[in-house]
Amino acid sequence: TQNKALPENVKYGIVLDAGSSHTSLYIYKWPAEKENDTGVVHQVEECRVKGPGISKFVQKVNEIGIYLTDCMERAREVIPRSQHQETPVYLGATAGMRLLRMESEELADRVLDVVERSLSNYPFDFQGARIITGQEEGAYGWITINYLLGKFSQKTRWFSIVPYETNNQETFGALDLGGASTQVTFVPQNQTIESPDNALQFRLYGKDYNVYTHSFLCYGKDQALWQKLAKDIQVASNEILRDPCFHPGYKKVVNVSDLYKTPCTKRFEMTLPFQQFEIQGIGNYQQCHQSILELFNTSYCPYSQCAFNGIFLPPLQGDFGAFSAFYFVMKFLNLTSEKVSQEKVTEMMKKFCAQPWEEIKTSYAGVKEKYLSEYCFSGTYILSLLLQGYHFTADSWEHIHFIGKIQGSDAGWTLGYMLNLTNMIPAEQPLSTPLSHSTYV
């Protein structure tokens, strides 16, 4: 008699990434009987919530419920109804909410309260909303990419699942760039992690990992831009800021109140004789790069070596996956190819930034002007951060892999977060059974 397949025995999980600039909902799926196996969880859906990050709802908290509706309804459609009550939902808020909490714990709590109340109305198993730490964000990003790359699996494969996958069990480092913070996480080579705050110990699938991580708050691409503007306006002779990080011919009016709204610009705050100023782009990569370097304090280091601002950074080791805005920006600039050297990237950035704004708008007519205008800054910032901030060199640049997805799942902290909260990464290596008999009768 022919074997008949039983109904698919699968589980689902939902994670909302409440970032500083937007919120994304991810739906994950895995075979129920293989929960402890490595690499079985995969992303089946990403839904980007329309609108800004949740921290921007402080003055319009009543709109949070509507804001989340479309993506939560999408989750209701994607996940079979019979599974709704068993499907956990987690919301993790990152640096945008960390900054709001720094300004006012009460306001941050109010936003999270309304977020939780709104999400609890859906038929899922809502497990709460919380602001994750920068250390968690780094750690879960590292877990995600290494889980998806099969680095925790004891079985070495004779084939490669992704183009840049090396066939050994050495883990990839993780480089994550958001709007308000950036994380660097990797396993250093036989190096003591000199600052306890940056040290993580994991036991995953029977193997111990000593991991370095740091999250630089205010050094995400959006907050770094606010920092740069606040720094540069200090020395402007009038309300015109000639800015090398924007294309020639670009003009934009900025409110001083908006500039000083974020805690990230507090160190540059001063009384200005105007309420508004105008950015006038001059499109010069080299000058832009120099201006960005002034955001990194490299004059002080209490350790054997530092990244910047006195933060310990061990010597870089192995390959790195650079994801989130590292990927989105470089993808837009067409610079994600493994074959593009650091020198070539720099050359292309010089050309891109020098292009007139009118020309750029014509070439990229479908792109929102707000985003389009900032690619010169963002690309330059990525180079500055990786080279001067984290000490990558022209040689080690080839060890950076700009990653959007791995086997269909987005690179980012959300998968690692869910794997941890659902206890799907065992400390010990599970006993492998030759065959699972649960699928066929």
Epitope: V61, I64, D109, L112, V114, S118, S120, F126
Partner: antibody, heavy 119, light 107 residues
């Protein structure tokens, strides 16, 4: 000192609806949340739902979703709980209670409203 | 949802004795657990919040402890007015849930 004063007892027929009010006095109403909890005769306490009047954000226990509506009127500092399609099992004392901040308990309670559902 | 299990269901004690009431959660509620006292015909009254903090006006004989999944309410020396039903409630996750109650009665 904040006080919550609820409307009087009600007797209702099965299939009908009941609307219980909860008026706050002596303190800020809008920024706090108001929760609704019921207690059937001789039974324990059961959370039904809640609202933050300032934002109109309401949430409900899955058991009551589609049958309960919680609203608030900031101008009169009053919260309302309407339960429809009443059945005999809905006979209970309905309490409103203040829930001042995120993840806080119910620190101030109304006196309760007895709702009897009988044909 | 989080299930709270209270034990014992009934506690028969004499005035002056120590009462120990237990509340166990089906998953961690961190320290977001409250205790209420309810007397016949009255609304519940908040005694303890965040596991161990006494609410305003609550006598020092009432104390709470625990975190995660196991919590205890202790009444160090029972007064005649303490004989009532006690409920625990978690405010960590929605929906808010209550334990089934422990009745403290006079022996």
């Amino acid at each position: 000192q904040v006080q919550l004063v609820q409307s009087g007892a009600e007797v209702k027929k099965p299939g009908s609806s009941v609307k219980v009010s909860c008026k706050a006095s002596g303190g800020t109403f809008s920024s706090n949340a108001i929760g609704w909890v019921r207690q059937a005769p001789g039974q324990g306490l059961e959370w039904m739902g809640g609202i933050i009047p300032a934002f109109g954000t309401a949430n409900y226990a899955q058991k009551f979703q589609g049958r309960v509506t919680i609203t608030a009127d900031e101008s009169t500092s009053t919260a309302y709980m309407e339960l429809s399609s009443l059945r005999s099992e809905d006979t209970a004392v309905y309490y409103c209670a203040r829930d001042p901040v995120r993840r806080s308990p119910f620190d101030i309670w109304g006196q309760g409203t007895m709702v009897t559902v009988s044909s | 949802e989080i299930v709270l299990t209270q034990s014992p269901a009934t506690l028969s004690l004499s005035p002056g004795e120590r009462a120990t009431l237990s509340c166990r959660a089906s998953q961690s509620v961190s320290s977001y657990l409250a205790w209420y006292q309810q007397k016949p015909g009255q609304a519940p009254r908040l005694l303890i919040y965040d596991s161990s903090n006494r609410a305003t006006g609550i006598p020092a004989r009432f104390s709470g402890s625990g975190s995660g999944t196991d919590f205890t309410l202790t009444i160090s020396s029972l007064e005649p007015e303490d004989f009532a039903v006690y409920y625990c409630q978690q405010s960590f996750l929605w929906p808010r849930t209550f334990g089934g109650g422990t009745k403290v009665e006079i022996k």
